[in-house]
Interface confidence: medium
């Protein structure tokens, strides 16, 4: 969490005072299922699970505040890391339809500092190429890349 | 979450051979690329290679490439990496990753705790 600025911090600890409605210090799954629904989100329990697995680094089932600023970190890391596809993508995306050709593929990738063989970007392609028209829908390919 | 254990490490002559796999538990394997890394007390984790989440693709650092060779059988779960014409530098302790994408770049979402690989002249 060292990357977080100090006012990040005194966000997050707010935010955090929300999660935890019992002010126990920690958060349960059922906490952060509540504060998720109530901003829109519909997460399943499983989910809920996986989310505090991930970051449960004592392993007892629930978060505390330096668990919970590791999740937020790394929740904001990868929403610039979607952002920084997506740009990349805009670049090639002349008209803005959300698709770009497989070629042009290898560009954004090339562009994203990533250096792969040739072999692995056809791999890419094939996977990011749903219907075969050699266009890529870049909402996929960017759900593709970051995991989600 | 998914859980990675590596085996296969231990002592082996410069020139020899070794080949270590890692076992993945908790999700879908096939969902997941894969990839080496190794590491040498007071540096940097090092990528060895790394391959496709279908094992269709795979990529290798320049210092082992045509010596080390990455497979993977997503029915048993497991990712090898086969060492061989081993030299003493290759000796560090050697961690299996997992990333949920085609092809594993960037930061791994996973780590495995790591298997000795000691090479001796």
């Known amino acids: 969490a060292d990357q977080l600025t100090e006012e990040q911090i005194a966000e997050f600890k707010e935010a955090f005072s929300l999660f935890d409605k019992d002010g126990d210090g920690t958060i349960t799954t059922k906490e952060l299922g509540t504060v998720m629904r109530s901003l829109g989100q519909n997460p399943t329990e499983a989910e809920l699970q996986d989310m505090i697995n991930e970051v449960d680094a004592d392993g007892n089932g629930t978060i505390d505040f330096p668990e919970f600023l590791t999740m937020m970190a790394r929740k904001m890391k990868d929403t610039d890391s979607e952002e920084e596809i997506r740009e990349a993508f805009r670049v090639f995306d002349k008209d803005g339809n959300g698709y770009i050709s497989a070629a042009e593929l290898r560009h954004v990738m090339t562009n994203l500092g990533e250096k792969l063989t040739d072999e692995e970007v056809d791999e890419m392609i094939r996977e990011a190429d749903i219907d075969g028209d050699g266009q890529v829908n870049y909402e996929e390919f960017v759900q593709m890349m970051t995991a989600k | 979450q998914v859980q990675l254990q590596e085996s296969g490490g231990g002592s082996v002559q410069a020139g020899g051979s070794l080949r270590l796999s890692c076992v993945a538990s908790?999700?879908?394997?096939?969902?997941?690329?894969m990839a080496w890394f190794r590491q040498v007390p007071g540096k940097e984790r090092e990528f060895v290679g790394r391959?496709?989440?279908?094992?269709?693709?795979?990529m290798y650092a320049d210092s082992v490439k045509g010596r080390f060779d990455i497979s993977r059988d997503n029915a048993k779960n497991t990712v090898f990496l086969q060492m061989s014409s081993l030299k003493p530098e290759d000796t560090a302790v050697y961690y299996c990753?997992?990333?949920?994408?085609?092809?594993?770049?960037?930061?791994?979402?996973?780590w495995g705790q790591g298997t000795q690989v000691t090479v001796s002249s």
């Open positions: 908790g999700r879908t394997f096939s969902s997941y690329a």
């Open positions: 990753a997992a990333k949920a994408a085609v092809i594993l770049t960037g930061i791994p979402d996973y």
């Open positions: 391959i496709s989440r279908s094992g269709g693709s795979t």
